[in-house]
């Protein structure tokens, strides 16, 4: 069942988003997502991931940058930037620690 989270080791992550229910969350990995909606300032959300690990490997665009990491509170001090309209060379480490 692709929707059911796997029963693997969990990591504790900083949680700062409207979906948080506490200061931290637990999941299979930690995430930072920087999103810019049309006509608004970019918003950075920190939390946990359990599904769709493939999002971690996506390249940054001018609208979204998705970062993942796998250690305790590893998403706490990460700051992301969005890609310029004309993207430069590929940014490494979007699925790193």
């Amino acid at each position: 069942d692709p929707v059911k989270p796997s029963r693997g080791p969990l990591v504790t992550c900083t949680c700062e988003s409207p979906h948080c229910k506490g200061p931290t969350c637990r999941g299979a990995w930690c995430t930072v997502v920087l999103v810019r909606e049309e006509g608004r300032h970019p918003q950075e959300h920190r939390g946990c991931g359990n599904l769709h690990r493939e999002l971690c490997r996506g390249r940054p665009t001018e609208f979204v940058n998705h970062y993942c990491c796998d250690s305790h509170l590893c998403n706490h001090n990460v700051s992301l930037v969005l890609e310029a309209t004309q993207p430069p060379s590929e940014q490494p480490g979007t699925d790193g620690q």
Epitope: K4, P5, R7, E16, C20, G22, T24, C25
Partner: antibody, heavy 125, light 112 residues
Framework: EVQLVESGGGLVKPGGSLRLSCAAS????????MSWVRQAPGKGLEWVGR??????????DYAAPVKGRFTISRDDSKNTLYLQMNSLKTEDTAVYYC????????????????WGQGTLVTVSS | DIVMTQSPLSLPVTPGEPASISCRSS???????????LDWYLQKPGQSPQLLIY???NRASGVPDRFSGSGSGTDFTLKISRVEAEDVGVYYC?????????FGGGTKVEIK
């Protein structure tokens, strides 16, 4: 750093009222589900109740012994949690802890990772 | 409500020796996702409780690896491989499967 500081405890007569406060800092309080847990002198831990974040409906749940007498509320602008205790009984005598924690993203699981130092409520004539 | 039962009530231990605490629930705490919704807390003398183990067997951050949690369904065990003097206090199990969350009565660990 997450910090929870309770206040408002004291001595009250049976049938009286008291309001406890919990000042929170170091995290986005408005997102957090907050609970009260109490401990009678020399006894074990007992969950009192919980309030969800406003984004999750802001609903409250209570343990059977306090339902209808205790009310949990929150002021997100002040990062403060409250426990209004009415019709107090001698068996409500306890240290009251404010707590919040950690949820597992794939389900409704929630643990209590962060605790205040507690405030003592004594109900006695 | 789910009833949590701990044993023993009191556990005298010798530093350096292992220790084990049992916790039983009145119904299964195994969630469909494969995790057991069972936590262990330690309350040291004069302090607030602290989380030791979550989801049955996962150590909370900063908890020494001499602590381990095991079990599934209704039977759970907290083990301390080599007790240290700082481990004294009251240990509680708690089920987090249903509201209200409920605690066991506690096990007081003290040095012999």
């Amino acid at each position: 750093e997450v910090q929870l500081v309770e206040s408002g405890g004291g001595l009250v007569k049976p049938g009286g009222s008291l309001r406890l406060s919990c000042a929170a800092s170091g995290f986005t309080f408005s997102n957090a589900w907050m609970s009260w847990v109490r401990q009678a002198p020399g006894k074990g831990l007992e969950w009192v109740g919980r309030i969800k974040s406003k984004s999750d409906g802001g609903t409250t749940d209570y343990a059977a012994p306090v339902k209808g007498r205790f009310t949990i509320s929150r002021d997100d602008s002040k990062n403060t949690l409250y426990l209004q205790m009415n019709s107090l009984k001698t068996e409500d005598t306890a240290v009251y802890y404010c707590t919040t924690g950690n949820y597992y993203d794939g389900s409704g699981y929630y643990s209590f990772d962060y605790w205040g130092q507690g405030t003592l409520v004594t109900v006695s004539s | 409500d789910i009833v949590m039962t701990q044993s023993p009530l009191s556990l005298p231990v010798t530093p350096g020796e292992p220790a084990s605490i049992s916790c039983r629930s009145s119904q299964s705490l195994l969630h469909s996702n494969g995790y057991n919704y069972l936590d262990w807390y330690l309350q040291k003398p004069g302090q607030s409780p602290q989380l030791l183990i979550y989801l049955g067997s996962n150590r909370a951050s900063g908890v020494p690896d001499r602590f381990s949690g095991s079990g599934s369904g209704t039977d759970f065990t907290l083990k301390i491989s080599r007790v240290e003097a700082e481990d004294v206090g009251v240990y509680y199990c708690m089920q987090a499967l249903q509201t209200p969350p409920t605690f066991g009565g506690g096990t007081k660990v003290e040095i012999k």
